[in-house]
Structures are given as structure tokens and as C-alpha cells.
């Protein structure tokens, strides 16, 4: 069961698997959640011990029974990992800790105006895990305003000390706030020849990449495939680092693949979730249980529901034995990866899906696109919402996109003349406007957040957030779309669609069924030539056919320009403005969401 509360002055006895240092019990709980085996923890605060070296210790614990004896101890704080919970889990920690110094290797020292600037520097430095900043009140004059960037092998401090007039905090890479480049390509027949920091077994290069991404020290990796000539190295995933943060050299080798950690583009790509099945494959590890079930999907479900299960192997039933039930071997290991991978065994293996909740929901695969036609089908664009106004009478006002369980992203110009959020209704999971009746459930709007630099659509900053009064439960027909990753500036999107209930031509009416159109992106230079009287800024993005014919139009405003890249849909643009609709050589102009990712995160994570 999911227990989120912390138990003050309680110590969990036994079950120790590791000790780390964390600045708070809350952070200790997050570390426990991300550890492959930790189910419970005890955090030692300042008052729990006379010995300062014991302060801020976070003892990670495991238990076969999923519980441990409780002992009263002043200053200790204990709790359970979030592994048992179904809610989204994030490693993002924006907290700044006052009068604490997290210890690590101080590899970079520079002047900074503020703790925030120091944290940004850490976030944009490939090696940085956390930082300490000496404030302007720091006693030693020559150390004032010094920003120390730090890293450790584990990503957690090697110790935490009380120190007056300093502040400390973590890199915000896991909050998707890094400006570092994000290299998604996997390079075939390539070995990166740099120092190995760890090695694990993986069934393919993509699992190897995910392991690298959430390993704090891993910057890139090399994976030896099943066909690799040296048998002892088959399925071996080498986690690597280098001083520069990039491979110093590459060696061409058949049957090896290499790639990069996705730590800088983490929020829009599945990192923790290994959802594939590996046929004719056995994962070896410590056996947790053996259960008779029908099929490998049922086996995966069993593993997902068993909190200690990390991976499984399903041995299909022989002929008609045992009512078609095969054996489901639930397994675990010290690091969450199989200790060995065997091929040609007839088994079907895979991983728990419990870790999927650590990934952003927006990375979930949705049903395939319906090719041809202009009318959408249910579940095709599950992030698309219809925003209604009830004043003077109820009508469709604008489109919008779900980007979080309480957040809709739309255009600022939609709210011209809207006096209060009370007159707004957000309908989610809607295909046809005719579905909306008096008793149709909707989401009220708690707050409208318009970009403070917005004046009019044509001059940019045409972006707004709606905070919903209640949270959205994600289903196949209503789920979020990923924001573009800041590390993806070089990506050229080739599969982009505009959707909405807007007019089909300039003088028309709102459509009943959600319409879709595939539209190519146009460079800003090209777009500027088409709109000589306007300034097309880098905060805008244009899309349209040279000959016209397909475009967003009145009523589509605020809706998404959705682009698919690497199997994940990204909200690349917000329908903003254009000259007429679908006119020749007049592309549609959209708010360039990439340029507002920081603004969105600042407002939604405040």
C-alpha cells in the first residue's frame, strides 16, 4: 500500500542496504524511491545525534515483508518509498538549503551574483550534481559570492555539514531545465573509448541508454549486442564518462552500439520505463517468486504489482499442460538489472512497469494516426481540449493542450474581453462539439496566467496557462503532450499536425468534429518574406503549404501544433495568427513553445 507520510522520531530497525547523505527527509524519500531495492528509509536529523558526522544520514532499507520494526528515536524521521504509490514521481528537487554545505568533489569555482545563478550554472554544467554558494554575508571575504560546482560518484553528497551563510542545492537537470545539448541518436558499429564507471547487463541499446540516463555519473555508453564476438561481453552495457563530457574518441566495431545519456531531455522521453518484451530470452537474477500465469503480459502485470520485483522471465506452457499456464519467474538484483541474459531459451522476459510512473505521462504511446481524411477519431489527439465561454451564451472559444494534470496551455489572445476565469469551462476527451450537453462534465478554471509581455498575437508572447480547479485523471482519451526539450534545438520536425474545431475557411462556422491537417514547418527566414509588415521573431514558428489549402483558422487559436519525433509527440506550437486562412504563401504563425519552456515550468512548478 502507498504510505506517503513521514514518521517523526521513529527509526526503522534493520534492513540496511545503503547509507547516503541527504539535506532533508523529503529528499531521502525521493532517493529511496529511485534506488532499485529501497522500500523504507530512516533519516537522521541534527537533533538525533551528538555526532555531527551522523547528521543528514539517509539509511536506505529493504524488507521481504515490506515493513520493519519501529523504534522510538528523537530526531529520526522514517518513511516508505513511493514505489508502492501510483502517482507521478519526480527526481526534481528545486529546494535551496540554507546554512548547509553538501560535500563532494569541488571541480569548479567561480563568482555568481546569486544562489539562483549558481544553480543555473550547475544545471547547465554536464558534470554538476549539486552546488554550494557562499552568500555575501559569508565571513571570509575572498569566498563571498563563490559558486562551487560539485559532483560525486553516486550523485549524492559524501557528507553534509552545517555552515553559516552558505546555501546548497541540486542541479535541475531532472526538472528538464538544462540547456545542454541532447543527443538522441544511437550510433551503430561504434565503441566509445573512455573510462567505464559501471557496467550492467541490458537486452538492447535502448535499455542501456535508459540505465545510463538515470545513473548520476553516466554521460554516454557503449553496448555490446547479442552478436558481439566475445561471448562474455554480450549484452554488456558500459556506462562511461570523460572530462570533457563527450567521447574523446570512437572506435568502429561491428555489433557494438553507442549513445548518450538523455539527462538533458529527460522530461520528454521514457527514461525509466522499459516496456518491451524480449522473446527467446531469459533474465537471470535472484528469484522472488514463481507463479503459474497465462501469458507474458500477465507475468509482467504480476511483476509490476509485486513491489520488490524488478524483472521477470516467463516460461510458456508446454503444449496443453496446466490449462495453458506457463511459469512466471519474478526476479530482482542489487542494481535492478539482470545478472546475466541468456538467449535461445524459449523464455519471454521483461521489466516491471512500476517505474513508468517516474517518466512523464506524455511519453506514453497513443493509438496510431489515421491516415487520410480531415476528421479525427477518438483518442487520436488526447491532449486537445475545447475551451468554452459561458458568457453571454455558451460556445467554443479556443483550443488548448493538456500539459499537466492541472494545466492547459493555450494562446493569450483567447482571453480578450474575458473578465473572470469563472465564465470558462474546459472540456477534455471530446471529439464532437455535439457531445457537450448541459450535464457534460467539465473542468473549471482556477486561474488564467497570461504572459506578462503579451500585447497582441502578432507581436508575440501569445501564450497563456489555465490552472484547473481539479486534477485530470489520465486515460487513453485524455493525457498530456510533451513540451519540446530545450536540448532539442537542432531537431527538425517533419511530422507536424494542427488540430481544432475552427473554421474550414475564412467565412465559416465552428466544426462539430475535431479536424486535423498535416502541415510542414517553414523556416523563419521564409516566413518573414511572406509577412513583410510583421516581425517574425525566434519566439514564433511558422507552418503551411506554399500553395495554401491547409491551415489553422478562426476557432483553432490556442490549440496545438503537434509534432512527432522519436515516437513521442511534442507541443511545438500554439495556434496564434496568420493572414486569412490557408492562403497561398501565407503560412500560419504559431507561438514557438520551445522558447517558453522555462516560463511554463516556472509557472506550473511554482
Amino acid at each position: 500500500e502507498c504510505v506517503t507520510r513521514l514518521f517523526k522520531d521513529i527509526h526503522f530497525e534493520g534492513g540496511d542496504i545503503a547509507t547516503v547523505f541527504t539535506p532533508s527527509a523529503k529528499h531521502c524519500q525521493v532517493v529511496c524511491t529511485h534506488h532499485p531495492r529501497c522500500l523504507l528509509f530512516t533519516f537522521t536529523g541534527e537533533s538525533a545525534s551528538e555526532d555531527p558526522t551522523q547528521w543528514f544520514t539517509c539509511v536506505l532499507k529493504d524488507s521481504v515483508t515490506e515493513t520493519l520494526p519501529r523504534v522510538n528515536r528523537t530526531g529520526a524521521i522514517s518513511g516508505y518509498s513511493f514505489k508502492q504509490c501510483s502517482h507521478q514521481i519526480s527526481a526534481c528537487n528545486k529546494d535551496i538549503y540554507v546554512d548547509l554545505d553538501m560535500k563532494g568533489i569541488n571541480y569548479n569555482s567561480s563568482l555568481a551574483k546569486s544562489a539562483q545563478e549558481c544553480q543555473e550554472r550547475c544545471t547547465d554544467d554536464i558534470h554538476c550534481h549539486f552546488f554550494t554558494y557562499a552568500t555575501r554575508q559569508f565571513p571570509s571575504l575572498e569566498h563571498r559570492n563563490i559558486c562551487l560546482l560539485k559532483h560525486t560518484q553516486t550523485g549524492t553528497p559524501t557528507g553534509i555539514m552545517k555552515l553559516d551563510k552558505v546555501v546548497t542545492g541540486f542541479s535541475l537537470k531532472s526538472c528538464a531545465l538544462s540547456n545542454l545539448a541532447c543527443i538522441r541518436d544511437v550510433f551503430p558499429n561504434t565503441v566509445f573509448a573512455d573510462s567505464n564507471i559501471d557496467s550492467v547487463m541490458a537486452p538492447d541499446a535502448f535499455v542501456c541508454r535508459r540505465i545510463c540516463t538515470h545513473h548520476p555519473g553516466c554521460l554516454f555508453f557503449t553496448f555490446f549486442s547479442q552478436e558481439w564476438p566475445k561471448e562474455s561481453q554480450r549484452n554488456l552495457c558500459l556506462l562511461k564518462t570523460s572530462e570533457s563530457g563527450l567521447p574523446s574518441t570512437r572506435i568502429k566495431k561491428s555489433k557494438a552500439l553507442s549513445g548518450f545519456s538523455l539527462q538533458s531531455c529527460r522530461h520528454s522521453i521514457p527514461v525509466f520505463c522499459h516496456s518491451s518484451f524480449y522473446h527467446d530470452t531469459d533474465f537471470l537474477g535472484e528469484e522472488l517468486d514463481i507463479v503459474a500465469v497465462k501469458g507474458h503480459e500477465a507475468c509482467q502485470k504480476l511483476c509490476t504489482n509485486a513491489v520488490r520485483c524488478q524483472f521477470f522471465t516467463y516460461a510458456p506452457a508446454q503444449a496443453s499442460c496446466n490449462e495453458g499456464k506457463g511459469k512466471c519467474y519474478l526476479k530482482l538484483s542489487s542494481n535492478g538489472s539482470p545478472t546475466k541474459i541468456l538467449r535461445g531459451t524459449g523464455g519471454i522476459s521483461g521489466y516491471t512497469l512500476r517505474l513508468c510512473k517516474m517518466d512523464n505521462e506524455c511519453t506514453t504511446k497513443i493509438k496510431p494516426r489515421i491516415v487520410g481524411g480531415t476528421a479525427s477519431v477518438r483518442g487520436e489527439w488526447p491532449w486537445q481540449v475545447t475551451l468554452h465561454t459561458t458568457s453571454p451564451t455558451q460556445r467554443h472559444l479556443c483550443g488548448g493542450s493538456i500539459i499537466g494534470n492541472q494545466w492547459i496551455l493555450t494562446a493569450a489572445h483567447c482571453f480578450y474581453g474575458v473578465e473572470s476565469p469563472k465564465i470558462l469551462r474546459v472540456y477534455i476527451g471530446i471529439l464532437n462539439q455535439s457531445e457537450i450537453k448541459e450535464d457534460t462534465s467539465f473542468f473549471g478554471v482556477q486561474e488564467i496566467i497570461i504572459h506578462d509581455q503579451y500585447k497582441m498575437a502578432e507581436s508575440g508572447y501569445d501564450i497563456a496557462l489555465l490552472k484547473l480547479e481539479t486534477t485530470v485523471n489520465y486515460t487513453d482519451s485524455q493525457r498530456p503532450i510533451c513540451l519540446p526539450s530545450k536540448g532539442d534545438r537542432n531537431v527538425i520536425y517533419t511530422d507536424c499536425w494542427v488540430t481544432g474545431w475552427g473554421y474550414r475557411k475564412l467565412r465559416d462556422k465552428i466544426q462539430n468534429t475535431l479536424q486535423k491537417a498535416k502541415i510542414p514547418l517553414v523556416t523563419n527566414d521564409e516566413c518573414q518574406k511572406r509577412y513583410r509588415g510583421h516581425k517574425i521573431t525566434h519566439k514564433m514558428i511558422c507552418a503551411g503549404y506554399r500553395e495554401g489549402g491547409k491551415d489553422a483558422c478562426k476557432g483553432d487559436s490556442g490549440g496545438p501544433l503537434s509534432c512527432k519525433h522519436n515516437e513521442v509527440w511534442h507541443l511545438v506550437g500554439i495556434t496564434s495568427w496568420g493572414e486569412g486562412c490557408a492562403q497561398r504563401e501565407r503560412p500560419g504563425v504559431y507561438t514557438n513553445v520551445l522558447e517558453y519552456v522555462d516560463w511554463i515550468l516556472e509557472k506550473t512548478q511554482a
Partner: antibody
């Protein structure tokens, strides 16, 4: 088919920075299957690899030039560029850009299959 | 860095002759080797990749062989348009390196 065209000044003063651009036409620079390379050839001599870049920004440089070389890519303009700082007369050469195939589909096709026609750069005051 | 040594540095031959150029790597490079042809004032042209694979559009009189450290480019019957300089190139490990070149001249 894909064509490459080098552009940039033919004469550079010593100690200055040599800047060349290679424009890719007839195909996209935005592909995981290629590295985009710079090679030079001193008068009457053999070929010397300077460095390569992937559209993602991943670069490799010749260690003998690494401290002076920067290769960058601009996917929106379908171009990649070379900057060589602190040049001397020894950097006088014909500079070529080339497409280096690193095919993601397997082992089948490698090597620098498309080259620019080359641009002569003279370093002289 | 891997040194690539080509021999001979020049060869005189007549039309119809069989010409063999060798290339030796200072360490094993598997089959990650390419051969290029360069004519005066022109850019190099890829002939062979992966030691023995013929680049499309290249006449079948050109062939490559070898693996590890020793490689050979053979022109089975020299044609007038084949008089040029030939370079081998390893791409097994960065930095990519070229051989010094072999000039095939008219006898």
C-alpha cells in the same frame, strides 16, 4: 543528388581565424546516418583529416589541430562550418568538406562518398 | 594515431596492366578501410569501402582485399582514366588517417 559547396575567404592573414562554410544541397544534413567532415591537402601533399561533426553536434577533431579547431552545424541552413584559429603559413592548403557515411542501417556503407570541389586558402600577410 | 603506410609511392604502368597498391596499418583496423582516387585539381572520389566493397558507379576493374593490418587495391586492367593518385584511409579509430598516396603514372 547530394552536393557540397565550400565557401569562405581565399586569403587569411597570419594569426587570424580561418572560417569556411560548407552548404549541403540536394539532401538534408539532418540525418543520423552521416558525419560531415573537413579535410585539407597541403600543396603537393597528401590528405589530412581535420575533424567531423554529426547533425546532433557531436564532434571529433584531429588531436594535432584540436586546440585551434571548431566545427559547428546549422541544421536550419543545411550548413556546417570550420573555424581554425591562429593560422600560420603552414595552414595554406586546399580545404575540402565531405559527407562521411556512418549508416545506421547496419554494416553496409562507409567512407566519404560525397566531396566538395575544394577551396584554396592561402595564409599570407 | 594509426599510421597508414602505402606502397609503392608511385608506379609506372601501361593501359591494360594489372596494378596492385598495398596499404599497411600500424595496428589492426578490422575491415574499416576505404580507398580513394584523386586526379589533379579535383576532389578525391570514393572507390572502395569496408576494405572490399565497391562503391556504386565505380567500374568492376577496381577491387579491394585485406583485413586487420594489410590491405590491397587492385586495378585489373588499367584504363587511361585511371591515371591518378590513390589514397587509403582508415576509419576504425578517430583520428581518421590517410596513407601518403600512390601515384599511378603512364609508362
Amino acid at each position: 543528388q547530394v552536393q557540397l559547396q565550400e565557401s569562405g575567404p581565399g586569403l587569411v592573414k597570419p594569426s587570424q581565424t580561418l572560417s569556411l562554410t560548407c552548404t549541403v544541397s540536394g539532401g538534408s544534413i539532418y540525418s543520423g546516418a552521416y558525419y560531415w567532415s573537413w579535410i585539407r591537402q597541403h600543396p603537393g601533399k597528401g590528405l589530412e583529416w581535420i575533424g567531423s561533426i554529426h547533425y546532433s553536434g557531436l564532434t571529433y577533431y584531429n588531436p594535432s589541430l584540436k586546440s585551434r579547431v571548431t566545427i559547428s552545424v546549422d541544421t536550419s541552413k543545411n550548413q556546417f562550418s570550420l573555424k581554425l584559429s591562429s593560422v600560420t603559413a603552414a595552414d595554406t592548403a586546399v580545404y575540402y568538406c565531405a559527407r562521411d557515411v556512418d549508416d545506421s542501417s547496419g554494416d553496409e556503407h562507409y567512407g566519404m562518398d560525397v566531396w566538395g570541389q575544394g577551396t584554396t586558402v592561402t595564409v599570407s600577410s | 594515431d594509426i599510421q597508414m603506410t602505402q606502397s609503392p609511392s608511385s608506379v609506372s604502368a601501361s593501359v591494360g596492366d594489372r596494378v596492385t597498391i598495398t596499404c599497411r596499418a600500424s595496428q589492426g583496423i578490422d575491415s574499416w578501410l576505404a580507398w580513394y582516387q584523386q586526379k589533379p585539381g579535383k576532389a578525391p572520389k570514393l572507390l572502395i569501402y569496408a576494405a572490399s566493397s565497391l562503391q556504386s558507379g565505380v567500374p568492376s576493374r577496381f577491387s579491394g582485399s585485406g583485413s586487420g593490418t594489410d590491405f590491397t587495391l587492385t586495378i585489373s586492367s588499367l584504363q587511361p582514366e585511371d591515371f591518378a593518385t590513390y589514397y587509403c584511409q582508415q576509419y576504425h579509430i578517430v583520428p581518421i588517417t590517410f596513407g601518403g598516396g600512390t601515384k599511378v603514372e603512364i609508362k
